[in-house]
Structure formats: structure tokens, C-alpha cells
Interface confidence: medium
Amino acid sequence: EPHSLRYNLTVLSWDGSVQSGFLTEVHLDGQPFLRCDRQKCRAKPQGQWAEDVLGNKTWDRETRDLTGNGKDLRMTLAHIKDQKEGLHSLQEIRVCEIHEDNSTRSSQHFYYDGELFLSQNLETKEWTMPQSSRAQTLAMNVRNFLKEDAMKTKTHYHAMHADCLQELRRYLKSGVVLRRTVPPMVNVTRSEASEGNITVTCRASGFYPWNITLSWRQDGVSLSHDTQQWGDVLPDGNGTYQTWVATRICQGEEQRFTCYMEHSGNHSTHPVPSGKVLVLQSHW
């Protein structure tokens, strides 16, 4: 899995007038990392993990950069013609990646009212756009605006690839995000369902990276997908992730069921508790 830095900037307009506020969210290796609030931009590390990466002294730099990006996007939105009445949004998503072989990828994507209308490969400078006429009209509009100011195009948009990678490398140097592996805590609970049945839920939390296998087994055999219900793998705000899987079983058959967890090449098996709750730290 590559290391990645993702900027998500959103600006709004109301009845054709661009609003002063904006929202910027930054994700590092898929984790919520920084947030720049709408009215007053102040980079806010998302949890202790982000603070550890940034260090107190560097927040001003992020604040300055994110504020600048927000202003640029507001100017772009102001140049989108034919804005209809009501509320509209322009979103820019910028992503850069460093792969294990040290190769890099960078891209930039624009969305209007949530619909993708323009993408750029920041390495090859190649632009792509969807086929729909509305998207193409928007895309030409925005591209033309970006090209109008040649100096800006050169110093800002074409430098984004290098800037993003530079920031990513700076964050990685902190050591906090360097290919770490955090094993999950696994917690199995049971609750009454209908008569004669119970629902057993297996929760994994506090793990990194996000890839995990969590499933219920009966007699060591994985249950079919249609008999299990999975939750999304979600960030928990601490630089780690959480998820769950549940299934319904017959009361009295608990001993046959185990929750199987596999993460970063390690695995563990967790029985259904006879009482209400059982918490086990994976002991690798």
C-alpha cells in the first residue's frame, strides 16, 4: 500500500455569489489528519496521532497553505459561468502517493455540485473529463480560467505535484506513520434476537493499516456472505480503524461459532462468550 496525502477543499456559492468560508480536510494514509474550518481557517490536527506527526511548531505552515488553497478555489468558482440560483459547491480533491518502489502518482479532481467534471494527472499534466456535455462545459470553463494566469498555472497548479510530495515526505519523516502496524482489539458480544436465536457481534478496533478480514466461522468454516452483516471500516479518530461483523445463531449452539480475524499477516480466533461480553487483545 502506498503512502498518500489527500487534500479535499470545498467552497460554496449562493445565488452566484461565492461565500467567504471554505472547508479543507486533509487525509494522511487514508486517516483524517487536518481540518481547516469554514469561516476561520486554523489547521486542526485530528487526534493525538496528527499532533505527533505535525509537532506544535508546524501548524502555522499548514494553516497558511490551506488558506491559500481555499482562496484559489474560491476564485475558480467565481469564474464558473451560468451558475443557477441557490446553493452550489466546487470541490477540489488533490492526491499524491509514494509507492514502495519510490515511484510517485499525483492527481487533481474537480467536482461541481458533487459531480466530477475535470481531472488532471499532475505528473503528465494530462487533463481528462467525463463525456457529458454539462461536465465538458464546466471543464472548459475552469481549464480556461486556470490557463489565463500563466504564472499561476506554472507556480501553483503545476507545482502541486512537487508540493504535495514534499509535504508527504515531511510528514513521513516524523516516523509516526512509517509502515506501522497496530493490531486490533477484538471484542465479541451477544444479544438476544428473536425466540431461540441470538445475535453475535465481533468488533475489531484500534488497528492499522485499514485492511482487515473479519468473519464468523461455524466449526472452523466461514459462514456464507448472505448470513453475515458487515460494518464499514471506519477511522476512529486516533489514526487507527474500527469495524464489525454480526450474525444470528441458534441459542445453545454458541460453542460452534468463532470470530476469525486476519490483519497484516497475523490472525486470531475468538469464541462467543458464555456471558455478555468478552474482550481479547490479539496476542501475536
Epitope: R217, Q218, D219, G220, V221, S222, S224, T258, H267, T269
Partner: antibody, heavy 118, light 108 residues
């Protein structure tokens, strides 16, 4: 390649005990249950029980509960079946098998013939 | 305990013929937990079909399975010489895990 290699044939007297070993390879030993099944000469298959090597949980077929003991040695990735108080009707081929993602018995050992005779 | 009864006990057929083997359960089981195995003389059983109708790895397409509830069927569309063997059904729906007594498919 997934394989389960069992120990060699045994000849035992009535009342004695026998211990059969099963050494899987080609997958993570603790990730799948180990099942034990036996087959008397010319007869069908009979499930003895299974063990989860990771947490050591064992489930027996009730008719073997008093005489069969299933164990694992995680350090050598080996599973064992011990059958005590042997009688002539315990003469059979004993198989170990792996619980699969898609079935209860997806890979089998080659079998161990246990002969009980006075 | 769920008892699986296989029929017929012996099936005498020629290569190229169609074989239909039945497995009847004493009480209803989920189709996810009905499996078929093939065993040749002097060999260990081999997983043939899992969850009623799914072919295990390397099993030829002439084998198929069907059924639900208490009645399940294994079909070999056109017998090949290597198909003559004993076939067992097995249920994993409830403890103890049980096998049928087997159906021997022999050359006529």
C-alpha cells in the same frame, strides 16, 4: 501445496491406548480447525471431533467423548488424536482433515491404520 | 443427530451413462452445509462438491449437485472410468457432523 501428513500404522492390544499425529503444511496451522474422522474396514466415515489450534477449543462427537483426546502442539504445528481403552471395533483407518473456507473437510491426511488385536 | 441416508447403496453403470445419487436427511438442513466426497479404494476421501452445488477445485464439470431441505442429489452427467468410486454426503448443519453410509458406483 497444502498437505496433512499422518503417523504410521499401529497395532495395539485391547485396553491399550494409541496416539496418532497429523502434521499439516502449506498454510498457517492455527488458522483452520483440525478434524478427525475414522473409517472401519468396509464401512463409512465417522466423525470423532475437532480442535481449534488457535484457542484450543475442542468439540467431540459424544460417543467418543470419554475415550478420545484431541491436542495440538503449536510449536511443531502438529495435531494429535489419542484413543484409550481400545477394543477390536476401534480397528479402523483414522484420518485428520482441515476445516476449509468452503467445506468442513477440504484437505485430508493419508490416513493411519490402527489395528486392535489380541 | 441428523441421519443421512444415501440411495442406492450400489449403482451399476457403464462408462458414458448418467449417474444420479441421492442423499436424504432425517431433518431439514441448510443447503450451505451439505457436501459430497469421493473415495477410491485405498485412498483418502476427496472433497467433490461443497454447499450443495459448488464444485471443489479441480473437479470436472460433469459433476453437479442440487437439492434443499431434506433431499439432495449428486449427478454425474457422463461417467468416466475414473469416476467409479464410493460417494459420501455429509452435513455440517448441526452436531454431531454426520456422513451418509455411501453409494458405490461400480462398472456394470
Amino acid at each position: 501445496e497444502i498437505q496433512l501428513v499422518q503417523s504410521g500404522a499401529e497395532v495395539k492390544k485391547p485396553g491399550a491406548s494409541v496416539k496418532v499425529s497429523c502434521k499439516p503444511s502449506g498454510y498457517a496451522f492455527t488458522s483452520n480447525n483440525i478434524y478427525w474422522v475414522r473409517q472401519a474396514p468396509g464401512q463409512g466415515l465417522e466423525w470423532i471431533g475437532y480442535i481449534d489450534p488457535y484457542i484450543g477449543r475442542i468439540i467431540y462427537n459424544q460417543q467418543f467423548k470419554d475415550r478420545a483426546t484431541l491436542t495440538v502442539d503449536k510449536s511443531t504445528s502438529t495435531a494429535y488424536l489419542e484413543l484409550s481403552s481400545l477394543r477390536s471395533e476401534d480397528t479402523a483407518v483414522y484420518y485428520c482433515s482441515r476445516s476449509g473456507e468452503r467445506s468442513n473437510f477440504d484437505y485430508w491426511g493419508q490416513g493411519t491404520l490402527v489395528t486392535v488385536s489380541s | 443427530e441428523i441421519v443421512l441416508t444415501q440411495s442406492p447403496a450400489t449403482l451399476s453403470l457403464s462408462p458414458g451413462e448418467r449417474a444420479t445419487l441421492s442423499c436424504s436427511a432425517s431433518s431439514s438442513i441448510s443447503s450451505n452445509y451439505l457436501h459430497w466426497y469421493q473415495q477410491k479404494p485405498g485412498q483418502s476421501p476427496r472433497l467433490l462438491i461443497y454447499r450443495t452445488s459448488n464444485l471443489a477445485s479441480g473437479v470436472p464439470a460433469r459433476f453437479s449437485g442440487s437439492g434443499s431441505g431434506t433431499d439432495y442429489t449428486l449427478t454425474i452427467s457422463s461417467l468416466e472410468p475414473e469416476d467409479f468410486a464410493v460417494y459420501y454426503c455429509q452435513q455440517g448443519g448441526s452436531l454431531p457432523l454426520t456422513f451418509g453410509q455411501g453409494t458405490k458406483v461400480e462398472i456394470k
